[in-house]
Structures are given as structure tokens and as C-alpha cells.
Interface confidence: medium
């Protein structure tokens, strides 16, 4: 499968460059004064963090003390209280709420830019294309606000941002100016740009929801690297539903469930639906401690 080759050759290409003694770029960025961008919610602007550790999950550590501490929650974009065990843990731990805010929040971090359905493009249309931090390159489409048209780009397979569409039509429907604006719920059969086969694709819609569930529920469906065609379900965080997709049998990401029920159980509970009058309809969800399978430092941190 070509996707594997793309990953491998990214490495070989670099090695070859050194062997040829051609100038290779140095990517040893200093961690000081570095900003990190995280997309956690379809309706919020990109979350900019002054420090990468602000993206780490709250870690109580292995010890048994009960100490009140604060951590920055990337889903709520707020500093929150948690109980620290007294040893180990990580840097996303602060003695006071003020210290947490100082280290991890910015003045504009919680500013919500409202979009009016049928009149304005969703905010994510204005984000720059972002390949993410992975290297499983696949063809995707993004809206280029400078040229006012959808364009093709290479997506690394994880993270990035919401200005990322599987098909050109999705991108055009949502972000390009047209006579009908963008379409809200188009479930046509479209060409899937990932595997070049005809599959039903759900069109992304301007978000009427907020998401506070596990991080992997926000990732796009990822077919993976192999050749199988297994029926799986992924959580589409834009429309708030579990949708079927074909899994190749290897690779991919955590947003991959063998049944719709399993998918709903894992992801639906984190969903909050917005209603037009500004109120919120909350779905039932237990506020139990989230155990995110992939550490935030591995999946969320993206150098600007």
C-alpha cells in the first residue's frame, strides 16, 4: 500500500539527503517561547498554548496523598481542580488556579466566534492547512481563504485542524461561496480522496455541538495501511454520530470501533448539543475520570 511507502520514504529521503551532502534543514526548535496549537472543538478558534505541558492529561501519580492541585483541561479550555497523589505526575500541575491560568491560558483563549447557519462560513474554513504531526500522508482538501477556493494538500493522518475535508465537494459545500451557501446535511455518495473508492461520505457541517469526550473521538476516520476491508464505526464529532467506515486491518487510529454501540458508548457521552436560543441540551454522561488511551503529549502537541 502506498501509504506505508510514504511514511518510509519520508525517512529515507532525509537519510539520502545527508548522504549527498546537500543542505538539510535543522528542525531542532527550542522549547522556550514556543507556541502550540490544538484543535479540540469545532466551534472554538485554535487553542494556542504557551507551553506544551498544558496539553498533558491530569496525572495524579502513583502515590496516595490527597493534595488539591490545578491542571489545564484542553477540552474545556479552563484550569480545573484535581487530586494529586503527591509524587511523580507531570508538569500540568499547579498549586493555584492563578498559576495555572498564568501558565496555560491566554486572554483570547475562550473567545467563541459564533457562526450563523446559511450566512457565514464556519470558523474552521479560515484556518491554514495543517498537515499535523504524523507522517501517514493522505490527500485532503482545505479552504484557502486567500484564493477563496478549496485546494488539495497532504495531511499527515493525525491532528491538524478542522479545515480538512476528505472530498473536494465537502470542502466546496462547506467553505466556498456559492449560490446556495453551504449545505447542511448532504449524505451523497462521493469519491473518497483517501482510498480513491466510492463510499458514502458525510459532509462536515458548521458545529452545533461542543465535545468534551475522549480525545480520539475527535480524530477523523483512518482506514489504516493494509488491504483488508473490515466494517468498523468511527465517531464523527462534527455531526455527533457514529458512522460506518472500511478499515484496512492495520494502522489507523483509536477512533475505530467494531460496533455502533461500542462507538456510541465511548464517544457519544462527551457530546453537548447547542440549541438555537443559546441554551444547552446536555446528554447524560457520567463525570467519571477519563482515561485517555494515548497520552496528550504524544497526540496533541503541534509546533507552530
Amino acid at each position: 500500500m502506498i501509504y506505508t511507502m510514504k511514511k518510509v520514504h519520508a525517512l529515507w529521503a532525509s537519510v539520502c539527503l545527508l548522504l549527498n551532502l546537500a543542505p538539510a534543514p535543522l528542525n531542532a526548535d527550542s522549547e522556550e517561547d514556543e507556541e502550540h496549537t490544538i484543535i479540540t472543538d469545532t466551534e472554538l478558534p485554535p487553542l494556542k498554548l504557551m507551553h506544551s505541558f498544558c496539553a498533558f492529561k491530569a496525572d495524579d501519580g502513583p502515590c496516595k496523598a490527597i493534595m488539591k492541585r490545578f491542571f489545564f483541561n484542553i477540552f474545556t479550555r479552563q484550569c480545573e481542580e484535581f487530586i494529586y497523589g503527591g509524587c511523580e505526575g507531570n508538569q500540568n500541575r499547579f498549586e493555584s488556579l492563578e498559576e495555572c491560568k498564568k501558565m496555560c491560558t491566554r486572554d483570547n483563549a475562550n473567545r467563541i466566534i459564533k457562526t450563523t447557519l446559511q450566512q457565514e462560513k464556519p470558523d474552521f474554513c479560515f484556518l491554514e492547512e495543517d498537515p499535523g504531526i504524523c507522517r501517514g500522508y493522505i490527500t485532503r482538501y482545505f479552504y484557502n481563504n486567500q484564493t477563496k477556493q478549496c485546494e488539495r494538500f497532504k495531511y499527515g493522518g493525525c491532528l491538524g485542524n478542522m479545515n480538512n475535508f476528505e472530498t473536494l465537494e465537502e470542502c466546496k459545500n462547506i467553505c466556498e461561496d456559492g449560490p446556495n451557501g453551504f449545505q447542511v446535511d448532504n449524505y451523497g455518495t462521493q469519491l473518497n480522496a483517501v482510498n480513491n473508492s466510492l463510499t458514502p461520505q458525510s459532509t462536515k457541517v458548521p458545529s452545533l455541538f461542543e465535545f468534551h469526550g475522549p480525545s480520539w473521538c475527535l480524530t477523523p476516520a483512518d482506514r489504516g495501511l493494509c488491504r483488508a476491508n473490515e466494517n468498523r464505526f468511527y465517531y464523527n464529532s462534527v455531526i455527533g454520530k457514529c458512522r460506518p467506515f472500511k478499515y484496512s486491518g492495520c494502522g489507523g487510529n483509536e477512533n475505530n470501533f467494531t460496533s455502533k454501540q461500542e462507538c456510541l458508548r465511548a464517544c457519544k457521552k462527551g457530546f453537548i448539543q447547542r440549541i438555537s436560543k443559546g441554551g444547552l441540551i446536555k446528554t447524560k454522561r457520567k463525570r467519571k475520570k477519563q482515561r485517555v488511551k494515548i497520552a496528550y503529549e504524544e497526540i496533541f502537541v503541534k509546533n507552530m
Partner: antibody, heavy 119, light 107 residues
Framework: EVQLVESGGGLVQPGGSLRLSCAAS????????LDWVRQAPGKGLEWVAD????????LYNQKFKGRFTISRDQAKNSLYLQMNSLRAEDTAVYYC????????????WGQGTLVTVSS | DIVMTQSHKFMSTSVGDRVSITCKAS??????VAWYQQKPGQSPRLLIY???TRHTGVPDRFTGCGSGTDYTLTISSVQAEDLALYYC?????????FGGGTKLEMK
């Protein structure tokens, strides 16, 4: 054998129009996107536009959007480029190329057709 | 738009020489680079895609490499039939852009 054969080039006056065609054969037409790329005399290559043969979704180089229109006819296994409001600087050899999604590159090219814009 | 710069318009070589043609992108193109060969009066021919993968039928004396913004096409032992124009192209994002070309000629 994959073959892309362009036609429709020729001499046209500034402000005029021209429609280029590209007949594709030797592969399943709907399996690959098709692109137009041009090359001015003695100059480099310049990507113009791309089309998905199944649904007709198009991508353009912003430089040509509005004046040039890419289209296709599945029944005829053909690609087209409608060029309007032509200028002297549009003088070039226009190539039809098959865009292979797995490679993300243009793996087969036609022989090209020369468009000359001059009064 | 991403600008692809091939700093050498011409490169002189001899049969059997090793030659490296370089290409620099104006921003990180994440190894999404292809190389094409064009002989006089002919259409371009794909040699390399994804920076280092040889296209079907391309002799193994052609190798590509690079990452970030810097990419190189190397011909390990130049043959007479290799004298041509070589173009790099980024396929990271549209509009796809090409380098200005490097003409390989005999010394």
C-alpha cells in the same frame, strides 16, 4: 498502453477563445484525475487545473480561474480545457496529464498541443 | 503559492559522472516532491515521487532524497541519454508548482 492525445491548439487572436481536448485511452478513465499543465516557449512548467472524472470536481490554479474551465466527458473518455479572453502570455504548449492519486504526481503526459495567441 | 527554486539553470557533466540537482521549496513540503525529466521536443516524464520513490521503469541510477524544504535528484552515473531538463515539483498543496528547471549538458 496509457495514451493521452491533445488536440485543439492553434493560432488565436488576443481576447479570443479556444477549446482544447485530450483523448484518454489504455486505462479506466474514472480511476484517475486528469490535469492540464502548460509550458511557455523556452520556459518552465505551470499547473493549470485538475478534474475528478467521476464527479467533475475541479481544482484550479487561481491564476487561471475565471478564464479557463476544465471539464470532462466520461462517455467519450475525454478531457477539455475551455480558454477564454486569451492573452499573448497564454502562448504555450498545453499538456494533458494523468494525476495518479497514490503517487500524488502526474505519471503520464500527452505530447502537448501548441496554443499561439497573437494578432 | 509555494515557490520551488532550482538554483542551477545549467549543469555540466560527463558520461559516468555522479551529479546532484537541487531544489529548494519556500516552505516545508513534507517530502511531497516529484522529479520530471524532459528531453527536447518531448513531454515531461515522471522519475521520482514522494521525494525518493522511483516511478516504474526508471533506472536505479536515479535517486531522490530530501525533507523539509531541501530536495535532491542524484544520477549516480550519468548516461548520454540522461542529458535533458529536470524539473522538481511540489505536490504538497495546490496550486502545484514546479522549479524553473535544470538543464544537464555535456562538458
Amino acid at each position: 498502453e496509457v495514451q493521452l492525445v491533445e488536440s485543439g491548439g492553434g493560432l488565436v487572436q488576443p481576447g479570443g477563445s479556444l477549446r482544447l481536448s485530450c483523448a484518454a485511452s489504455g486505462y479506466t478513465f474514472t480511476d484517475y484525475n486528469l490535469d492540464w499543465v502548460r509550458q511557455a516557449p523556452g520556459k518552465g512548467l505551470e499547473w493549470v487545473a485538475d478534474i475528478n472524472p467521476i464527479n467533475g470536481a475541479t481544482l484550479y490554479n487561481q491564476k487561471f480561474k475565471g478564464r479557463f474551465t476544465i471539464s470532462r466527458d466520461q462517455a467519450k473518455n475525454s478531457l477539455y480545457l475551455q480558454m477564454n479572453s486569451l492573452r499573448a502570455e497564454d502562448t504555450a504548449v498545453y499538456y494533458c496529464a494523468r494525476y495518479y492519486g497514490d503517487y500524488d504526481a502526474m505519471d503520464y503526459w500527452g505530447q502537448g498541443t501548441l496554443v499561439t495567441v497573437s494578432s | 503559492d509555494i515557490v520551488m527554486t532550482q538554483s542551477h539553470k545549467f549543469m555540466s557533466t560527463s558520461v559516468g559522472d555522479r551529479v546532484s540537482i537541487t531544489c529548494k521549496a519556500s516552505q516545508d513540503v513534507h517530502t511531497a516532491v516529484a522529479w520530471y525529466q524532459q528531453k527536447p521536443g518531448q513531454s515531461p516524464r515522471l522519475l521520482i515521487y514522494w521525494a525518493s520513490t522511483r516511478h516504474t521503469g526508471v533506472p536505479d541510477r536515479f535517486t531522490g532524497c530530501g525533507s523539509g524544504t531541501d530536495y535532491t535528484l542524484t544520477i549516480s552515473s550519468v548516461q548520454a541519454e540522461d542529458l535533458a531538463l529536470y524539473y522538481c515539483q511540489q505536490h504538497y498543496t495546490t496550486p502545484y508548482t514546479f522549479g524553473g528547471g535544470t538543464k544537464l549538458e555535456m562538458k
